[in-house]
């Protein structure tokens, strides 16, 4: 039962994260939550950084600055793969939740 619940939580979190990505950066509150998660957990996107390519409001070859290893204004524009966190946030934050919750 515990595994079923955990999988359900992870599925919900994945859906919610992707939903919030759709609103980035149009919704200030959503943007700040996503940026906080990506910066604090050193991750980018839901599954990985390529998820940002599918977001209409994000120009091509752009990820949020919060994906960058060294955050500075504009670092996510025309990014170099070596300069950003490539791991997805759902798995990374999920791993942290499994350990700590």
């Amino acid at each position: 039962a515990g595994y079923v619940f955990r999988d359900k939580v992870m599925s919900e979190f994945n859906n919610n994260f992707r939903q919030q990505m759709e609103n980035y950066p149009k919704n200030n509150h959503t943007a700040s939550i996503l940026d906080r998660m990506q910066a604090d957990f050193k991750c980018c996107g839901a599954a990985n950084y390529t998820d940002w390519e599918k977001i209409p409001s994000m120009s091509k070859n752009r990820v949020p600055d919060s994906c960058c290893i060294n955050v500075t204004v504009g670092c996510g524009i025309n990014f170099n793969e070596k300069a950003i966190h490539k791991e997805g946030c759902v798995e990374k934050i999920g791993g942290w939740l499994r350990k700590n919750v």
């Epitope: 950066p25 200030n28 943007a31 700040s32 906080r36 910066a39 949020p64 919060s66 204004v73 524009i77």
Partner: antibody
Framework: QVQLQESGPGLVKPSETLSLTCTVS????????WNWIRQSPEKGLEWIGY???????NYNPSLKSRVTISVDTFKNQFSLKLNSVTAADTAVYYC????????????WGQGTMVTVSS | EIVLTQSPGTLSLSPGERATLSCRAS???????LAWYQQKPGQAPRLLIY???SRATGIPDRFSGSGSGTDFTLTISRLEPEDFAVYYC?????????FGQGTKVEIK
């Protein structure tokens, strides 16, 4: 609700250093760019620079040689130091927040007037 | 640096009228990173529009932004008494970030 509050002396002597602090309350200092902006009748609104929680800074080239912005994450504060001030540095100084998604300066402090005079 | 020129300097209108404010950049604004702010006497500027056309949280829908490249516009569809203030545009696409000189919207 996040609020910003500037503090520091309102009067600074020419050639001395202007020091201001911005205290962030009601929210975290992480995951934002923290800025200083000033406003005077002569120059209008002028961006001074920003700092990120990691310590990364970017300054306006016109002030770069005289400016230092620092951050204290434990106190939820960031500070401005402007040295060798002249009367031209007399202005209202604001601190302001910008999100990493580049949502411009969405939250401002109320501003503090700094006069440079002997 | 990018120089922003706002026009007109002063706009005299009556409540209920439409206000159109212009902001022209000396060179193209990267990613349309252009914002509009409203400032009233003795107060800090308040963000209205960012990214040229996105309304900030809590801003009424009578405020709208448009434009790209070097030409940008802030439109207030129907002026309310509280809208009479000074409006500034700002670009944050290229460092140093710069502001326009402002447009004052006053009661006719």
């Amino acid at each position: 609700q996040v609020q910003l509050q500037e503090s520091g002396p309102g009067l600074v002597k020419p050639s001395e250093t202007l020091s201001l602090t911005c205290t962030v309350s009601g929210g975290s200092i992480s995951s934002y760019y923290w800025n200083w902006i000033r406003q005077s009748p002569e120059k209008g609104l002028e961006w001074i620079g920003y700092i990120y929680i990691s310590g990364t800074t970017n300054y306006n080239p016109s002030l770069k040689s005289r400016v230092t912005i620092s951050v204290d994450t434990f106190k939820n504060q960031f500070s401005l130091k402007l040295n060798s001030v002249t009367a031209a540095d007399t202005a209202v100084y604001y601190c302001a927040r910008m999100g990493l998604g580049r949502e411009a300066f969405d939250i401002w402090g109320q501003g503090t007037m700094v006069t440079v005079s002997s | 640096e990018i120089v922003l020129t706002q026009s007109p300097g002063t706009l005299s209108l009556s409540p209920g009228e439409r206000a159109t404010l212009s902001c022209r950049a000396s060179q193209s604004v990267s990613n349309n990173y252009l914002a509009w702010y409203q400032q009233k006497p003795g107060q800090a500027p308040r963000l209205l529009i960012y990214g040229a056309s996105s309304r900030a949280t809590g801003i009424p829908d009578r405020f709208s932004g448009s434009g790209s490249g070097t030409d940008f516009t802030l439109t207030i569809s129907r002026l309310e008494p509280e809208d009479f203030a000074v409006y500034y545009c700002q670009q944050y696409g290229s460092s140093p970030w710069t502001f326009g000189q402002g447009t004052k919207v006053e009661i006719k």
